[in-house]
């Protein structure tokens, strides 16, 4: 990646160790709603209730990000180009990749209340 700001982080599975169920991959975004002020930080966490832990890769606007596998993606000092839709892909050895829902990251300019629409990055 560019500078790797993904942080490896261990969490216990959300289903019993022996479970073979294909559980949904959950993508959690902080701040909630994905709207952040310029220069702020966005943290994306991919929660996969599977054992053993799968490899997690990240996508932005449907394109793989050049990052080592990690369940957490941290984007500090958010700027215009960070806006877009993000998803994570969990790859298990036992079955094919599972992609999470996509979450949208947007920049709130000062004085705005919520996610912005229209031209990305201002004009």
């Amino acid at each position: 990646m560019g500078s790797s700001h993904h942080h490896h982080h261990h969490s216990s599975g959300l289903v019993p160790r022996g479970s073979h169920m294909l559980e949904e991959v959950q993508l959690v975004v902080e701040p909630e709603g994905g709207a952040v002020a310029p220069g702020g930080t966005v943290t994306l966490t991919c929660e996969v209730p599977a054992q053993p832990s799968p490899q997690i890769h990240w996508m932005k606007d449907g394109v793989p990000l050049p990052l080592p596998p990690s369940p957490v993606l941290i984007l500090p000092e958010i700027g215009p180009q960070d806006q877009g839709t993000y998803s994570c892909v969990a790859t298990h050895s036992s079955h094919g990749p599972q992609e999470s829902r996509a979450v949208s990251i947007s920049i709130i300019e000062p004085g705005e209340e919520g996610p912005t629409a229209g031209s990305v990055g201002g004009s």
Partner: antibody
């Protein structure tokens, strides 16, 4: 404000070595990687490669493997480009330009460029 | 390597004109394309990213469009300060590659 400030012009002889610096300010240096771009006189832009400012890992375009080396002095928020065994065809302006990742992002801030002239 | 072809190296224009600069990728790059402006003696400046998004502070007379292999930078109401070289660049995969550039000149 965000700035990338490069070292001054260099006049070198063939076979010598040059080391260009790019000092970043206005942001956290390790949050964004650094690209190096060559522009020969009157020509277009050529991507030389990218250095990950967290790990120091470099990616070089095929044409720039061998005599070219990227390095960092993270404590000084500075990236370096070293060119060994200079050749006449290295005469160019070299730019540093930041991007969050090597792909998926454009280069949003550029240094002012460093002119390197190689002549005997 | 992905080749970015800017077929028009020079374009003659007048103040107030609408100008379209085209760029063709040798393979599908999605929307991972940026456009840069380089005025004489200056460093390049990011105008457009993700093929169609204007970067902060860029006047709205600059518009990017396209996806896949065909991309266009359109400049409506050309101003004297817009006389410059314009480069497209793909950042879908490395090596990153630029077009050769299109120079806007006054008629």
């Amino acid at each position: 404000q965000i700035q990338l400030v490069q070292s001054g012009p260099e006049l070198k002889k063939p076979g010598e070595t040059v080391k260009i610096s790019c000092k970043a300010s206005g942001y956290t240096f390790t949050n964004f990687g650094m690209n190096w771009v060559k522009q020969a006189p009157g020509k277009g832009l050529k991507w030389m490669g990218y250095i990950n400012t967290n790990t120091g890992e470099s990616i070089y375009s095929e044409e720039f493997k061998g005599r070219f080396a990227f390095s960092l002095e993270t404590s000084a928020s500075t990236a370096y480009l070293q060119i060994n065994n200079l050749k006449n065809e290295d005469t160019a302006t070299y730019f540093c330009a930041r991007s969050r990742m090597v792909t998926a992002y454009g280069m949003d801030y550029w240094g002012q460029g460093t002119s390197v002239t190689v002549s005997s | 390597d992905i080749v970015m072809t800017q077929s028009q190296k020079f374009m003659s224009t007048s103040v107030g004109d609408r100008v379209s600069i085209t760029c063709k990728a040798s393979q599908n790059v999605g929307t991972a394309v940026a456009w840069y402006q380089q005025r004489p003696g200056q460093s390049p400046k990011l105008l457009i990213f993700s093929a169609s998004n204007r970067y902060t502070g860029v006047p709205d007379r600059f518009t990017g469009s396209g996806s896949g292999t065909d991309f266009t930078l359109t400049l409506s109401n050309m101003q004297p300060e817009d006389l410059a070289d314009y480069f497209c660049q793909q950042y879908s995969s490395y090596p990153l590659t630029f077009g050769v550039g299109t120079k806007l000149e006054l008629k």
